[in-house]
Interface confidence: low
Amino acid sequence: MRGSHHHHHHGSSHMAPTHQLPPSDVRKIILELQPLSRGLLEDYQKKETGVPESNRTLLLCLTSDSQPPRLNSSAILPYFRAIRPLSDKNIIDKIIEQLDKLKFQHEPETEISVPADTFECKSFILTILQQFSACLESVFKSLNSGPQ
């Protein structure tokens, strides 16, 4: 899909909050993200019937060091930046905008390369969208069960 490329790794930093957002703000962001994510996933599933989920792609979308789990924006953002060209321009940009609000400035962001093979690429995108939707559900539930 991508053609051959030269690759060298380094993180890229973007403007982001230096402190943790209050739960009410996080809840607002999650509420914004849910319909965007669901719409994107449903749209993709309609277009790409018969594409299986990839067992090689794992979106580490929740932090393991906080209780309740927090959305790991720094881990998610690179995947959405990578699939931007292959999905709905406006929806992906809105998702990135919301994820940027959740990201901490000191957290490094690694670039992700989309699989070169067309079928693998479709599977990769589907998996990211499915796992992200599931993560949002999980975070939303934990936010609702805790203090508002």
Epitope: H8, H10, S12, H14, M15, L86, K89, I92, E109, E111
Partner: antibody, heavy 118, light 111 residues
Framework: EVQLVESGGDLVKPGGSLKLSCAAS????????MSWVRQTPDKRLEWVAT????????YYPDNIKGRFTISRDNAKNTLYLQMSSLKSEDTAMYYC???????????WGQGTSVTVSS | DILLTQSPASLAVSLGQRAIISCKAS??????????MHWYQQKPGQQPKLLIY???NLEAGVPTRFSGSGSRTDFTLNIHPVEEEDAATYFC?????????FGGGTKLEIK
């Protein structure tokens, strides 16, 4: 307002080198992939190189690979194209272009002219 | 490499009429149900400007008289009704595969 201003174009001899720069403003430079596209004297457009938003991934067509190097300095909001082993067929107007992700080129600079001739 | 063939090379259209420009790809440029084909307008002495991205999406600020359609190998740019300011050269470009390639251009003249 998105602005891309190219500089560094010149008349150069075959086999020579040249470095083009593109100063970007009006948008968050480090969030966008960037490309160089050239327009030959007969007005044909040719893609030259692309670099991902953080600089980790670079892409070139086969006729360019090994001769040109695209790079970026996100702290300075600047894109570069280092050109070496220049040939007469590299004569063109070189445009700096903002990318949407990897695939759509939504803003183009005014261009800088490169002439390769003895 | 994917070859893009634009037709016609030039056309003259009366003010208010419809201009249709075709772009044919040597192989499919669709991915995930989307045509990775884009259209640019270039006026004399100016840089190209994005009009339509991914086959049919109108770029922000572009008048609605411009529209794009097509999938796989056949794509079309429609301009209706044509206005004086539309006199320009139009290019298609694919990003389905590297190297990205452009069509040879179609010069539109307004009668």
């Amino acid at each position: 307002e998105v602005q891309l201003v190219e500089s560094g174009g010149d008349l150069v001899k075959p086999g020579g080198s040249l470095k083009l720069s593109c100063a970007a403003s009006g948008f968050s430079f480090s969030n966008y992939g960037m490309s160089w596209v050239r327009q030959t004297p007969d007005k044909r457009l040719e893609w030259v190189a692309t670099i991902s938003y953080g600089g980790s991934y670079t892409y070139y067509p086969d006729n360019i690979k090994g001769r040109f190097t695209i790079s970026r300095d996100n702290a300075k909001n600047t894109l570069y194209l280092q050109m070496s082993s220049l040939k007469s067929e590299d004569t063109a107007m070189y445009y700096c272009v903002r990318g949407y992700g990897y695939d759509t080129m939504d803003y183009w600079g005014q261009g800088t002219s490169v002439t390769v001739s003895s | 490499d994917i070859l893009l063939t634009q037709s016609p090379a030039s056309l003259a259209v009366s003010l208010g009429q419809r201009a249709i420009i075709s772009c044919k790809a040597s192989q499919s440029v669709s991915f995930a149900g989307t045509g990775l084909m884009h259209w640019y307008q270039q006026k004399p002495g100016q840089q190209p400007k994005l009009l339509i991205y991914r086959a049919s999406n109108l770029e922000a600020g572009v008048p609605t008289r411009f529209s794009g359609s097509g999938s796989r190998t056949d794509f079309t740019l429609n301009i209706h009704p044509v206005e004086e300011e539309d006199a320009a050269t139009y290019f298609c470009q694919q990003s389905r595969e590297y190297p990205w390639t452009f069509g040879g251009g179609t010069k539109l003249e307004i009668k």
